[in-house]
């Protein structure tokens, strides 16, 4: 490593604001709830309710707290070490492939299908075919979801569109 010279401008952003307590980094890293100063000499606390950091880090800034959207409820507020936890309101859910918004759960299953799973904040109601126990999506259900078919009726996937 080349020897380094450091020169500090006294800009307001570099001075510790009253609410931003400082401590020294450990092996170049600051603990959760802090970020590092530009010169790497200080750990500056995140601002409660505004930003946070969850891990030991050498980042110049804390991460901005998530604001729950309308249609979401706040399960736990943002702290200096943990982001806000938001959850879809009752009757709505968030899909993995479209996590940006809460969607309304279906009110019932299509004809010929039976409900085996309720609406939760992370999943729609789950429907299986009355006869075969096949999920509405066409997937073969897990063992605990299987609907017992009557004797002599082979369990085969049914093709349902929609």
């Amino acid at each position: 490593e080349s020897a380094l010279i450091t020169q500090q401008d006294l800009a307001p952003q570099q001075r510790a604001a009253p609410q931003q307590k400082r401590s020294s980094p450990s092996e170049g890293l600051c603990p959760p709830g802090h970020h590092i100063s530009e010169d790497g000499r200080d750990c500056i606390s995140c601002k409660y309710g505004q930003d946070y950091s969850t891990h030991w880090n050498d980042l110049l800034f804390c991460l901005r707290c998530t604001r729950c959207d309308s249609g979401e409820v706040e399960l736990s507020p943002c702290t200096t070490t943990r982001n806000t936890v938001c959850q879809c309101e009752e009757g709505t859910f968030r899909e993995e492939d479209s996590p940006e918004m809460c969607r309304k759960c279906r009110t019932g299953c299509p004809r010929g299908m039976v409900k085996v799973g309720d609406c939760t904040p992370w999943s729609d109601i789950e429907c299986v075919h009355k006869e075969s126990g096949t999920k509405h999506s066409g997937e073969v259900p897990a063992v605990e979801e299987t609907v017992t078919s009557s004797p002599g009726t082979p369990a085969s996937p049914c093709s349902l569109s929609g």
């Epitope: 450091t6 020169q7 401008d9 530009e38 110049l60």
Partner: nanobody, 123 residues
């Protein structure tokens, strides 16, 4: 998308001067450091100088101290390196880089790099 575009390189005689520029776009971080690194043929990329956008903290490698000056224009989002008293050993490709880490003088702490501009010092 972060983009860095260096300019100002060229050929100069020993003792001469050059001013490098690095125009940055797509930077939306609350604070970041911008640096100059250089790489001579057959050698590893080495740190030259850094400046932090928010507080203005500045770093120089010992080898360029007193000869090179780093500066920034916040309004233009542009980084500069004024190089004077140039020597043959300053010959290299000069790269502009951006980090969101503190006290960053190692290449691995940088996530964004420009394409580089050639500086050649010869009689």
């Amino acid at each position: 998308e972060v983009q860095l575009l260096e300019s100002g390189g060229g050929e100069v005689q020993p003792g001469g001067s050059l001013r490098l520029s690095c125009a940055a776009s797509g930077l939306t971080f609350p604070n970041y450091g911008m640096s100059w690194f250089r790489q001579a043929p057959g050698k590893e990329r080495e740190f030259v100088s850094a400046i932090y956008w928010s507080g203005g903290t500045v770093y120089y490698a010992e080898s360029v101290k007193g000869r090179f000056t780093i500066s920034r224009d916040n309004a233009k989002n542009t980084l500069y390196l004024q190089m004077s008293s140039l020597r043959a050993e300053d010959t290299a490709v000069y790269y502009c880089a951006v980090t969101i880490r503190g006290a960053a003088t190692q290449t691995w702490k940088y996530d964004y790099w420009g394409q580089g501009t050639q500086v050649t010092v010869k009689p």
